[in-house]
């Protein structure tokens, strides 16, 4: 069955947008006007995972690209990466765990917790133009809250 997906953009709680930084990295920065066209459009797919009444498992692919955000250990540290996949097989309902994020809505803000590494979240830095990363702390300096903007297909 085709997996249910929607197209969207994400901004962190400081209103920074996410853009590509090289072929396999995202960075967060403030954009205005025509520059807003640079922000990445995600294809958010609803997938199987350890769903709860508060957490919805999703996979975050880059629209019309065979790239997905995934969480892996690098040098013993949970790390966010963009991973290339075979477009014939993705997205799928039963995504591998490294591709799955628990979408958590709190006070109209979204958090994306790694299914592979509980309590690690998609994060941005306070500073401009820094990479999007997987962070192990909430409520500190780094930003783990996002808003989602729907994009028509």
């Amino acid at each position: 069955a085709p997996v249910r997906s929607l197209n969207c953009t994400l901004r962190d709680s400081q209103q920074k947008s996410l853009v590509m930084s090289g072929p396999y990295e995202l960075k967060a920065l403030h954009l205005q006007g025509q520059d807003m066209e640079q922000q990445v459009v995600f294809s958010m797919s609803f997938v199987q995972g350890e769903e709860s009444n508060d957490k919805i498992p999703v996979a975050l692919g880059l629209k019309e690209k065979n790239l997905y955000l995934s969480c892996v250990l690098k040098d013993d540290k949970p790390t966010l990466q963009l991973e290339s996949v075979d477009p014939k097989n993705y997205p799928k309902k039963k995504m591998e765990k490294r591709f799955v994020f628990n979408k958590i809505e709190i006070n109209n803000k979204l958090e994306f917790e790694s299914a592979q590494f509980p309590n690690w979240y998609i994060s941005t830095s306070q500073a401009e133009n820094m990479p999007v990363f997987l962070g192990g702390t909430k409520g500190g300096q780094d930003i783990t809250d996002f808003t989602m903007q729907f994009v028509s297909s």
């Epitope: 069955a1 199987q48 995972g49 350890e50 769903e51 709860s52 009444n53 508060d54 957490k55 309902k93 039963k94 995504m95 591998e96 765990k97 509980p118």
Partner: antibody, heavy 122, light 107 residues
Framework: EVQLQESGPGLVKPSETLSLTCTVS????????VSWIRQPPGKGLEWLGL???????YYNSPLKSRLTISKDNSKSQVSLKLSSVTAADTAVYYC????????????????WGQGTLVTVSS | DIQMTQSPSSLSASVGDRVTITCQAS??????LNWYQQKPGKAPKLLIS???TLRPGVPSRFSGSGSGTDFTFTISSLQPEDFATYYC?????????FGQGTKLEIK
């Protein structure tokens, strides 16, 4: 060998809270989810909800406001509490282990307890 | 929620008969369909997972097929111990939902 055993009072008064315990062996509650299912006398099976290995819970909508599932990993016990019960909650209550195989069979239920009958009556 | 429509609700058959039960999902569930056998006073027992995978120790006279929305459960040659109630369960999305059950009785 995987085993699950439900226990609790067989009789509960209307408007009170039904409390059951599922004691498991042969697997770790920190690794596998456990579901609760019920079956009214002579009727079919109704899935109530589950608790995952990490402790998150999913409750089926019709019972969401009355149902609480919790666990104690160290005691290998999962508990179910259903508040404000009525005669319609009279059923055999089962707990069951989730298969929990990511990317293959995450949501299936492979092993069940023998069930415990709870009657709601004054 | 996904609705599971199971038929027939009851069935009379004789030892040695071939018996078929069907389950229809209200939306595509791929192969995420389990079949359970329940005898009176006992817990359901998983016979088949993922539409057609026979569980260890389950006799080969039991089989399952189908994908998407339409599924079939077959007992190729009924044995006396097979008279029971059978349920399908979709394990594709939460909440999990069961079919209404099929009571298999001796003719």
């Amino acid at each position: 060998e995987v085993q699950l055993q439900e226990s609790g009072p067989g009789l509960v008064k209307p408007s009170e809270t039904l409390s059951l315990t599922c004691t498991v062996s042969g697997f770790s509650l920190s690794e596998y989810g456990v579901s609760w299912i019920r079956q009214p006398p002579g009727k079919g099976l109704e899935w109530l909800g589950l608790i995952w290995g990490g402790g998150d819970t999913y409750y089926n909508s019709p019972l969401k406001s009355r149902l609480t599932i919790s666990k104690d990993n160290s005691k290998s016990q999962v508990s179910l509490k259903l508040s404000s019960v009525t005669a319609a909650d009279t059923a055999v209550y089962y707990c069951a282990k989730q298969t929990n195989v990511w990317g293959y069979d995450l949501y299936g239920m492979d092993y069940w307890g023998q069930g415990t009958l709870v009657t709601v009556s004054s | 929620d996904i609705q599971m429509t199971q038929s027939p609700s009851s069935l009379s058959a004789s030892v040695g008969d071939r018996v078929t039960i069907t389950c229809q999902a209200s939306q595509d569930i791929d192969d995420d369909l389990n079949w359970y056998q329940q005898k009176p006073g006992k817990a359901p027992k998983l016979l088949i997972s993922l539409a057609n995978t026979l569980r260890p120790g389950v006799p080969s006279r039991f089989s399952g097929s189908g994908s998407g929305t339409d599924f079939t459960f077959t007992i190729s040659s009924l044995q006396p111990e097979d008279f029971a109630t059978y349920y399908c369960l979709q394990s594709s999305w939460l909440p999990l939902t069961f079919g209404q059950g099929t009571k298999l009785e001796i003719k």
